[in-house]
């Protein structure tokens, strides 16, 4: 004879655990049904009656099978420097990520708590390390023979054009000016742009403890080869 399937609630065999999507209720001392994502427990089980579930109310959610008496509140609306990459539904929390040109200075379990504008490297400085979803741009001074004449979070230092006859020598923030009509370049002409970081939902972000006060973004800027004050400007 096949083993009889137990219907919830049921007393588990000694030493055994409840099945998938069930939980052991320590008061009833029974295996009882969990509620599905998007629901919560309205009435806990007894020895003879199973869990009664109800849908989460507006602006609340449960993401997992559960037996919580109340759904979780969705996070507050995304701020102006963020985009909503996942809406608040009965089964998932709202996720806010930083809009293009910004990076996440303070992350949370899913999405970002605090966005900060990507550093712009001022003339004479180029991008040494591009910004990512979670890290700021790092600027570096343009080495001899290279320059950057822009205030940009994407432009790197470019080589000076090589002149047959130099009218004005190049420096860190200006290209060389040639007198001849046919200058040559050591590299391909045109500004070199690094791609903007794209804000996407991180699948494996680690929870970050919330600070007691919102940190100043000036303390969140990574130190590059040169101090931020010398190689960057604020927006």
């Amino acid at each position: 004879l096949p083993a009889q399937v137990a219907f919830t609630p049921y007393a588990p065999e000694p030493g055994s655990t409840c099945r998938l999507r069930e939980y052991y209720d320590q008061t009833a001392q029974m295996c009882c049904s969990k509620c599905s994502p998007g629901q919560h427990a309205k009435v806990f089980c007894t020895k003879t009656s199973d869990t009664v579930c109800d849908s989460c109310e507006d602006s609340t959610y449960t993401q997992l099978w559960n037996w919580v008496p109340e759904c979780l509140s969705c996070g507050s609306r995304c701020s102006s420097d963020q985009v909503e990459t996942q809406a608040c539904t009965r089964e998932q929390n709202r996720i806010c990520t930083c809009r293009p040109g910004w990076y996440c200075a303070l992350s949370k379990q899913e999405g970002c708590r605090l966005c900060a504008p990507l550093r712009k490297c001022r003339p004479g400085f180029g991008v040494a390390r591009p910004g990512t979803e979670t890290s700021d741009v790092v600027c570096k001074p343009c080495a001899p023979g290279t320059f950057s004449n822009t205030t940009s979070s994407t432009d790197i230092c470019r080589p000076h054009q090589i002149c047959n006859v130099v009218a004005i020598p190049g420096n860190a923030s200006m290209d060389a000016v040639c007198t001849s009509t046919s200058p040559t370049r050591s590299m391909a002409p045109g500004a070199v742009h690094l791609p903007q970081p794209v804000s996407t939902r991180s699948q494996h972000t680690q929870p970050t403890p919330e600070p007691s006060t919102a940190p100043s973004t000036s303390f969140l800027l990574p130190m590059g080869p040169s101090p931020p004050a010398e190689g960057s400007t604020g927006d």
């Epitope: 320590q26 008061t27 009833a28 427990a41 309205k42 009435v43 806990f44 007894t46 020895k47 003879t48 009656s49 009664v52 008496p69 109340e70």
Partner: antibody
């Protein structure tokens, strides 16, 4: 409006059995998720949970007093009855009945009835 | 059985003070804790359930927090009408009350 009221003797002798009745209105013990429990409070002391009965007649007792307690319900009369055997002077207390929600906390309490155990 | 250790057993504070009462369970109670206020000669009144959910009509100066086995009731700004004894109730495994905290005004 939910109300509960306890009734029973104010004085019982040691070894006797105490019978208390909780009569309630504003809800029904035939409604899914509803329950009624009993709590007592000796003079100047803390609250102590005694027993509880659910809409489906499932019952729970304080393990330390289980052998002395019996809880029953009469759904048609909107009543819950608690009996406590072998009363002792240490059982002198105010006895409260309270409604319990489907998620197991007491939300509305009766006014309480004082029971003195003395010979 | 789960034991609930409530502290302090009594406290005296000035009007406007922040008052904190703690309850420690002998095991994890999964946030299943309620707080009651009992004024002298009166019936216990439910303030908070499921750790932090305020009952309708309860002033917002009352708040609850905690997880695992440690829970707190906070009165952010003590008022004269808050003079009472406060009890925690765990309902994670059967039901157990804490020993109570008597709150007085200095």
């Amino acid at each position: 409006q939910v109300t509960l009221k306890e009734s029973g003797p104010t004085l019982v002798k040691p070894t006797q059995t105490l019978t208390l009745t909780c009569t309630f209105s504003g809800f029904s013990l035939s409604t899914l998720g509803m329950g009624v429990g009993w709590i007592r409070q000796p003079p100047g002391k803390a609250l102590e949970w005694l027993a509880h009965i659910w809409w489906d007649a499932d019952k729970y007792y304080n393990p330390a007093l289980k052998s002395r307690l019996t809880i029953t319900k009469d759904t048609s009369k909107n009543q819950v009855v608690l009996t406590m055997t072998n009363m002792d002077p240490v059982d002198t207390a105010t006895y409260y009945c309270a409604r319990m929600t489907g998620t197991r906390y007491f939300d509305v309490w009766g006014q309480g009835t004082t029971v003195t155990v003395s010979s | 059985d789960i034991q609930m250790t409530q502290s302090p057993s009594s406290l005296s504070a000035s009007v406007g003070d922040r008052v904190t009462i703690t309850c420690k369970a002998s095991q994890n109670i999964n946030k299943f804790i309620a707080w009651y206020q009992q004024k002298p000669g009166k019936v216990p009144k439910l303030l908070i359930h499921y750790t932090s959910t305020l009952q309708p009509g309860v002033p917002s100066r009352f708040s609850g927090s905690g997880s695992g086995s440690d829970y707190t009731l906070t009165i952010s700004s003590l008022q004269p009408e808050d003079v009472a004894t406060y009890y925690c109730l765990q309902y994670g495994v059967l039901w157990t009350f804490g020993g109570g905290t008597k709150v007085e005004i200095k």
